[in-house]
């Protein structure tokens, strides 16, 4: 038997990918063990085998469809269980009646290009990727901006409280190299998280005319 | 400019079926959920149900399921909310929205019904 | 099935004067809470969502707040246009329901 304290988190990315990381205190390395959905009124069920992603803990993503299929609803329940083999047997570890529209967090977004620089300013936009069209604009984004010398850990967040998919930065230092990144969070769903940042943007402002008060 | 237009006023003998129809137009109706609400004198706003028309699923209230039933036909952007076994307390304004599913953004400007003998 | 109570039933106050109205669920719903403005004749219109968010559009005055299963939609300074019937709606458990309404009359 497994001992310990066990923790069993998921997410739903509002589309057909619901990810799961679990946790467990004094787990056994060898075991299989793996992630079971079942919706409560769909006729499919889905299997994904948790793999280890640090000494005492698990993750894998239950792939319900095609990327950009709603495959649930704000109706759905789906009882997720987290099953090892034990011997011939499968033991229930970890289970939860989770609501996908309750946990959600969104794939990070995508295609982040620059629109337009200038020596002080830069306009970026990017897109969202597999969101359900359920949020219609109720979107808000989080981003940040890396200046030379400083973490990401230091930049200050830029807040949209609305679904606008583009950003102008402003007061920047003339031909100088920056990173941009960029997330997205659902205003529904009481355990709603932010998605992962972007991929990071590497931009660089034009260099100030020579001669020039700019 | 979003809009929902329903069609006209209906009056209906009991045991009778009814057909509203919401027209819409400024938003991509393919990719939307349009939903019913009823609007009795004595009982308030009820939900209906839904229409999911990206992903082809309908959903309805408990109280209704039995006797409603919601269709689009995408390629005229008009949703339709049908109710049968009409009774006196049917008579009602019956709305179409559009809004994700959890609250309805814009109104349809209401169809009243009204069942009498 | 969720129910919402609101209180009071009809509520009289005076141009200019701040207006504070009530919704409560039957059980626990989260932030899932969202409040509509009817006037005579007309569809509702969409004020607040999830408890205290505003809609593009809807003017300042109109705020909303939570404390556990109560909430409440505050409009700050009374405009003529503001005397309506507003109803609060919750989307935590389907058949998401509406509140029986509160009628905001001139005093």
């Known amino acids: 038997a497994v001992n310990g304290t066990s923790q069993f988190t998921c997410f739903y990315n509002s589309r057909a990918n619901i990810s799961c990381v679990w946790s467990q205190d004094g787990a056994l390395q060898d075991t299989s063990c793996q992630v079971h959905a079942w919706p409560d009124r769909r006729r499919w069920n889905q299997t994904c085998e948790l793999l280890p992603v640090s000494q005492a803990s698990w993750a894998c993503n239950l792939i319900l469809g095609a990327p950009d299929s709603q495959k649930l609803t704000t109706v759905d329940i789906v009882t997720l269980r987290v099953l090892c083999r034990e011997g011939v047997r499968w033991r229930v570890m970890a289970i939860q009646d989770f609501k996908p529209f309750e946990n959600l967090r969104l794939m990070a977004p995508i295609s982040l290009q620059v629109v337009h620089v200038e020596t002080h300013r830069c306009n970026i936009s990017w897109e969202i990727s597999q969101a359900s069209h359920y949020f219609e604009r109720h979107l808000e984004f989080e981003a940040r901006t890396l200046s030379p010398g400083h973490t990401w850990e230091e930049a200050p967040l830029l807040t949209l409280k609305q679904k606008q998919e583009w950003i102008c930065l402003e007061t920047l230092t003339p031909d100088t190299q920056y990173e941009f990144q960029v997330r997205v969070k659902p205003l529904q769903g009481e355990f709603t998280t932010w998605s992962p940042w972007s991929q990071p943007l590497a931009f660089r402002t034009k260099p100030a005319a020579l001669g020039k008060d700019t | 400019e979003v809009q929902l237009v329903q069609s006209g006023a209906e009056v209906k003998k009991p045991g009778a079926t009814v057909k509203i129809s919401c027209k819409v137009s400024g938003f991509n109706f393919k990719y939307s959920l349009i939903h019913w609400v009823q609007q009795a004198p004595g009982k308030g706003l009820e939900w209906m149900g839904w229409?999911?028309?990206?992903?082809?699923?309908?959903e309805y209230a408990p109280g209704f399921q039995d006797r409603v039933t919601i269709t689009a036909d995408t390629s005229t952007d008009t949703a339709y909310m049908e109710l049968s076994s009409l009774r006196s307390e049917d008579t009602a304004v019956y709305y179409c929205?559009?809004?994700?599913?959890?609250?309805?953004?814009?109104w349809g400007q209401g169809t009243t019904v009204t069942v009498s003998s | 099935e969720i129910v919402m109570t609101q209180s009071p039933a009809t509520l009289s106050v005076s141009p200019g004067e701040r207006a504070t109205l009530s919704c409560r669920a039957s059980q626990i719903i989260s932030n899932n809470l969202h409040w509509y403005q009817q006037k005579p004749g007309q569809a509702p219109r969409l004020l607040i969502i999830?408890?205290?968010q505003s809609i593009s559009g809807i003017p300042a005055r109109f705020s909303g707040s939570r404390s556990g299963t109560e909430f409440t939609l505050t409009i700050s300074s009374l405009q003529s246009e503001d005397f309506a019937v507003y109803f609060c709606?919750?989307?935590?458990?389907?058949?998401?329901?509406f509140g029986q309404g509160t009628k905001l009359e001139i005093k």
């Open positions: 999830y408890g205290l």
């Open positions: 929205a559009r809004g994700g599913p959890w609250f309805l953004s814009y």
């Open positions: 709606q919750q989307s935590n458990n389907w058949p998401y329901t």
């Open positions: 229409i999911d028309n990206e992903a082809g699923e309908t």
